[in-house]
């Protein structure tokens, strides 16, 4: 028979034949052959693999470093990574929670809707049309664009959510 060019779900192609992938929580020891099944082995303590795979090494569980203010929110298993969170009163800097800050800053293009309290983190909001923020800040609101008209100037460059408008002199009509 013709060797396969594609395999079913949860299989992979090797040496012109389809082998079963290892299930989550297990790593590949040896590929299948014409006569043998794929050989898989469970991940060790503090290791995981979260997908059907052909990996020869399991991934290490994330370490929640207490020196960075991190603690374990959910212990990892052979199929899932450890989930870290921050100590009480501190906030993760990202979804991956790799470090902790007292309160998060709002990125350029966003302003502070509510300053952090002892209980809640900073609440950010996107700067609407007519407003901008060009800094990362835990305190600053979006600023309104400069009104060129009130300075008897015209808009030379439009503002964005991250930049103010640029004003310039009115074009003088030539005689």
């Amino acid at each position: 028979p013709e060797p396969p060019t594609a395999c079913r779900e949860k299989q992979y192609l090797i040496n012109s034949q389809c082998c079963s992938l290892c299930q989550p929580g297990q790593k590949l020891v040896s590929d299948c052959t014409e006569f043998t099944e794929t050989e898989c082995l469970p991940c060790g303590e503090s290791e995981f693999l979260d997908t059907w795979n052909r990996e020869t090494h399991c991934h290490q569980h994330k370490y929640c470093d207490p020196n960075l203010g991190l603690r374990v929110q959910q212990k990892g298993t052979s199929e899932t990574d450890t989930i870290c969170t921050c100590e009480e009163g501190w906030h993760c800097t990202s979804e991956a929670c790799e470090s902790c800050v007292l309160h998060r800053s709002c990125s350029p293009g966003f302003g502070v809707k509510q300053i952090a309290t002892g209980v809640s983190d900073t609440i950010c909001e996107p700067c609407p049309v007519g407003f901008f923020s060009n800094v990362s800040s835990a305190f600053e609101k979006c600023h309104p664009w400069t009104s060129c008209e009130t300075k008897d100037l015209v808009v030379q460059q439009a503002g964005t959510n991250k930049t103010d408008v640029v004003c310039g002199p009115q074009d003088r009509l030539r005689a």
Epitope: G69, L102, H103, R104, A138, E140
Partner: nanobody, 116 residues
């Protein structure tokens, strides 16, 4: 390496005043939003006041509004906190920091004790 060294703390009577200073180095000071935080005995960190890089915008926690004034001298890379009408509940170790204030670097604080 970022270095932040707070000084100016001490023992003061209720109603008294103190001026804290913070010497900063290892980063571009005028570009950074700066913050004062404090930790009272047995309590967590509480933000007290913050100031924009230019010094044009200042922010205060409700507990110190009208009593404390934050300022900065960008030519000296120094942050200040003028504390007036001090109360017993202002007793804490005060730390300065740059935003975002990271868990792994607080710098050296200065102890303020308000007591008669």
């Amino acid at each position: 390496e970022v270095q932040l060294l707070a000084s100016g703390g001490g023992l003061v009577q209720p109603g008294g005043s103190l001026r804290l200073s913070c010497a900063a180095s290892g980063f571009t000071f005028p570009q950074e939003e700066m913050i004062w935080v404090r930790q009272a005995p047995g309590k967590g960190l509480e933000w007290v006041s913050a100031i924009s890089g230019s010094g044009g915008s200042t922010y205060y926690a409700d507990s110190v509004k009208g009593r404390f004034t934050i300022s900065r001298d960008n030519s000296k890379n120094t942050l200040y906190l003028q504390m007036n009408s001090l109360r017993a509940e202002d007793t804490a170790v005060y730390y300065c920091g740059k935003e975002p204030f990271r868990y792994d670097y607080w710098g050296q604080g200065t102890l303020v004790t308000v007591s008669s």
